[in-house]
């Protein structure tokens, strides 16, 4: 390893500010990638990383292109991916990412899905459908023109799918309340059966959300098809048109036919043979997480390593798993010492009031991102419903039926299923199954046991206790728990089931169907109380209003989590309230939010993260 002239931070509680965003990934994924990239270094050195919302941060993170405000312009696609400055004041310590790159998780463009049977999982490219390979969303197998994708590598085998961002699901901004396009629609007396840029000078595609724009004046902007936006060729920035004709043959996805180098391309009109318009299809992109982890190494004081396997080696290569090599660890520990426990503690967050994650840079009529809010719930306009009609229906080969699906297997950040010894110290637990404030004490659940944490002097920690002894009906593994602050009823969730305890009396298990949650909701990540017997119910990046009395969600209320809670991990596995703050847990960490008590106000005032910390050190107050 090499260090940079001995430069390092003179404190161990490092703050960072995400100044702006790339449109290649949803904001919550970008937030998560950066948090994970910092956590890589926090795992092996006594450093903590706290997100703040202003330029006083130690590390300011910025996406930019070409000349972007420092003396080191970026170089367009590929080549230089990002750069970072060594520790110090001002621009020193900052990390800049070239937004001419395609930022992904390292495996291609990230396309979130809607409806279907995959609970919002991103598309898997390439995927196989009816024996053919697809590297972009497709309308094959459907007669309504709605693009879809498989969320696993093989749709034929797994049958897992979702719908891609499309104007047939929803529109963005405008005044059409997010409703889907209505095709055909009338504009200036003419009929349009696709999104158009007519009437606009900025090139943004739009449509009417009723059959007659001239009469109703209702419209929205059409979501960008990131999976099909070409680069290079002679049509950069245009969309692939599927199907297209090339040498007399019809193609429904990107192809490498006609090329010696194997690169995938598509036509941007329906007939390449006549129009000769084409571009390259999006590639695998660069893992924002891996590049950020490398850049943050620089921002902490590490120079490049000569060890090819090291994260700090100057060449990008995609890898999975923990990215640090012994050389990286030796380098960061040379600078900051050994151990991963925060020393000193994470700082109190910035005294300035948290700002929105990024100020709007365009007028609100312009769609800012390819990753819009969750589509509107099904209505008479004909957005697909998550019933059998909404699936790709290829005919006799077997249309998928979006019935109950098995819960996804736990990822590396989710709880293990090893049995817990009662003697085990909760400070050794990496990830708790559930955390909830019950009867004034914070309860930490893990594999059929729980601890109680009383926030006062003396011996605040009690347990472990057997969960089944206190709440006999419950399974060993929980997803979340919640106490209704008014009635003191305690709700427990595991998989697609819910139990409600009133004292020692239990109601349940009840299926999530009974709550009005469809089969795509495989678990509940948590609830947050709201006034008047209401709560917010969270699952996999989405949030519903939940009536605690009727125990039903309002299906019209579903929105993406980041629309109400900016900057929290989209895949938080546990969400709870404690001392009037909301906590969103992911892995070992929590994101704390000071939230307003009203939700879904017309202006959607977004609640802001005010602290990030360790569950064990900061909540359990482990040594």
């Amino acid at each position: 390893f090499q260090t940079f002239k001995g430069l390092k931070w003179d404190h161990h509680n490092i703050t960072y500010w995400i100044q702006n965003y790339s449109e290649d990934l949803p904001r919550d994924m970008i937030d998560d990638a950066f948090a994970r990239a910092f956590a890589v270094w926090g795992e092996v050195a006594p450093l903590t990383f706290t997100r703040v919302y202003g330029p006083e941060a130690d590390i300011v993170i910025q996406f930019g292109v070409a000349e972007h405000g420092d003396g080191y312009p970026f170089d367009g696609k590929d080549g230089l991916l990002a750069h970072a400055f060594p520790p110090g004041a001002g621009v020193q310590g900052d990390a800049h990412f070239d937004d001419d790159e395609l930022w992904s998780l390292g495996k291609g463009v990230v396309i979130p899905t809607y409806y279907g049977n995959s609970n919002g999982a991103p598309c898997h490219f390439p995927f196989t459908f009816e024996g053919r390979s697809y590297s972009a969303c497709t309308t094959d197998g459907r007669n309504d023109g709605t693009p879809w994708c498989s969320t696993t590598a093989d749709y034929d085998k797994d049958g897992k799918f979702g719908f891609c961002p499309s104007e047939r699901l929803y529109t963005e901004h405008g005044n059409g309340e997010g409703k889907p396009c209505v095709f055909p629609f009338i504009f200036e007396g003419r009929s349009y059966s696709a999104c158009t840029t007519k009437g606009r000078s900025d090139g943004y595609r739009w449509c009417a959300t009723t059959a007659n724009y001239d009469q109703d004046k209702l419209y929205g902007f059409c979501p960008t098809r990131v999976d099909a936006t070409v680069v290079g060729g002679n049509s950069a920035g245009e969309l692939c048109v599927f199907p297209f004709v090339f040498l007399g043959k019809q193609y429904s996805s990107c192809t490498s036919d006609g090329r010696r180098d194997g690169r995938l391309w598509c036509a941007t009109t329906s007939n390449f043979d006549t129009d000769k318009k084409w571009g390259f299809c999006p590639d695998q992109g660069y893992s924002l997480f891996l590049v950020a982890a490398h850049e943050f190494g620089h921002a902490l004081g590490l120079d490049h390593s000569s060890v090819p396997e090291a994260l700090m080696y100057p060449l990008y290569s995609y890898l999975e798993g923990f990215p640090l090599n012994k050389d990286d660890i030796d380098g960061i520990q040379y600078l900051y010492g050994r151990g991963s426990k925060p020393d000193p503690r994470p700082p109190a967050t910035t005294t300035t009031e948290p700002q929105p994650t990024a100020p709007p840079t365009m007028c609100p009529t312009i769609p800012p991102t390819a990753y819009p809010t969750v589509g509107p719930t099904v209505g008479p306009t004909g957005a697909p419903s998550p019933g059998p009609t909404s699936s790709p229906s290829p005919g006799p080969t077997g249309a998928p039926s979006p019935g109950p699906t098995a819960p996804p297997t736990a990822g590396s950040s989710e709880a293990s299923t090893e049995s817990l010894s009662p003697a085990d110290n909760p400070c050794n637990v990496d990830v708790f199954d559930a955390i909830a404030e019950i009867q004034g004490a914070l309860h930490f659940f893990k594999d059929g046991w729980y601890w109680k944490f009383l926030n006062h002097r003396g011996s605040p920690l009690q347990g472990p206790f057997l969960t089944a002894r206190t709440w006999p009906a419950l399974p060993a593994t929980l997803d979340s728990a919640f106490e209704d602050p008014q009635t003191k009823r305690v709700f427990f969730f595991s998989g697609r089931q819910m139990w409600v305890y009133t004292g020692k009396t239990v109601l349940g298990p009840r299926s999530l169907d009974k709550l009005g949650l469809g089969p795509e909701v495989t678990h509940v990540s948590g609830l947050l109380p709201r006034r008047l017997g209401k709560a917010l119910l969270f699952s996999k990046g989405r949030v519903w209003r939940f009536d605690l009395k009727s125990q039903k969600v309002d299906p019209q209320s579903v929105i993406r989590v980041d629309k109400e809670f900016s900057g929290v991990p989209w895949n938080s596995h546990d969400i709870f309230q404690y001392q009037d703050k909301a906590y969103f847990c992911h892995g070992k960490f929590f994101w704390r939010v000071s939230f307003q008590n009203e939700v879904n106000k017309v202006d959607h005032e977004v609640n802001q993260v005010d602290d990030v910390g360790y569950v064990t050190y900061d909540l359990l107050q482990c040594p």
Epitope: G71, G79, L80, A82, P86, V91
Partner: antibody
């Protein structure tokens, strides 16, 4: 030992063309940003152009559209194609190696320079 | 573009004296400043990078300081071989720019 050796200078009429070369040795040429900097007689230093390892190029406003920088990493050679030359382009042209490389931006400075080649534009 | 202003234009000092050369940027450039020495008929030579770090092989009598907009090159005790023109160069913002130079001559 790092060495940079320019060639290709000479006398040229206004509107004419010249191609400068800079042969590099003693370091991994393909990893570094390479620059052309010029100095008019009795004047100070002025940057002309830079080329990144990826081939991306930048130019001073005064030469944009007339000069083209390029590199051949297999030959460890940097080039400057100068077209539509003007009297004010008369100068000693130096090639210079950036001290830094890649994405760690702090090592500011040109740590090695060629000896320079004189370009005279005159009728 | 950022303007770099060096002062004085000419500095006349005797061997053994201390030389202080100034460079001012028209806006903040953090510490992205380099100093070069150029002797007649020769190419410039890097002395100081990042405002205060001596380049390889540069004698300890040369030192750099400053950040933001004001920078100083100090030669603690002048040697006969130090008489030359000195340039500062910024890379705090694009494009890079050089100062007009300070001529250090024997008094």
């Amino acid at each position: 030992e790092v060495q940079l050796l320019e060639s290709g200078g000479g006398l040229v009429q206004p509107g004419g063309s010249l191609r400068l070369s800079c042969a590099a040795s003693g370091f991994t040429f393909s990893q570094y940003d390479m620059w052309w900097v010029r100095q008019a007689p009795g004047k100070g230093l002025e940057w002309v152009s830079v080329i990144y390892p990826s081939g991306t190029t930048f130019y001073a406003d005064s030469v944009k559209g007339r000069f083209t920088i390029s590199r051949d990493n297999s030959k460890n050679t940097l080039y400057l194609q100068m077209n539509s030359l003007r009297a004010e382009d008369t100068a000693v042209y130096y090639c210079a190696k950036d001290r830094a490389y890649g994405d760690y931006v702090g090592w500011n400075g040109f740590d090695y320079w060629g000896q320079g080649t004189l370009v005279t534009v005159s009728s | 573009d950022i303007q770099m202003t060096q002062s004085p234009a000419t500095l006349s000092l005797s061997p053994g004296e201390r030389a202080t050369l100034s460079c001012r940027a028209s806006q903040s450039i953090s510490s992205f400043l380099a100093w070069y020495q150029q002797k007649p008929g020769q190419a410039p030579r890097l002395l100081i990078y990042d405002a205060s770090y001596r380049a390889t092989g540069i004698p300890a009598r040369f030192s750099g300081s400053g950040s933001g907009t004001d920078f100083t090159l100090t030669i603690s005790s002048l040697e006969p071989e130090d008489y030359a023109v000195y340039y500062c160069q910024q890379r705090g913002n694009w494009p890079i720019t050089f100062g007009q130079g300070t001529r250090l001559e024997i008094k």
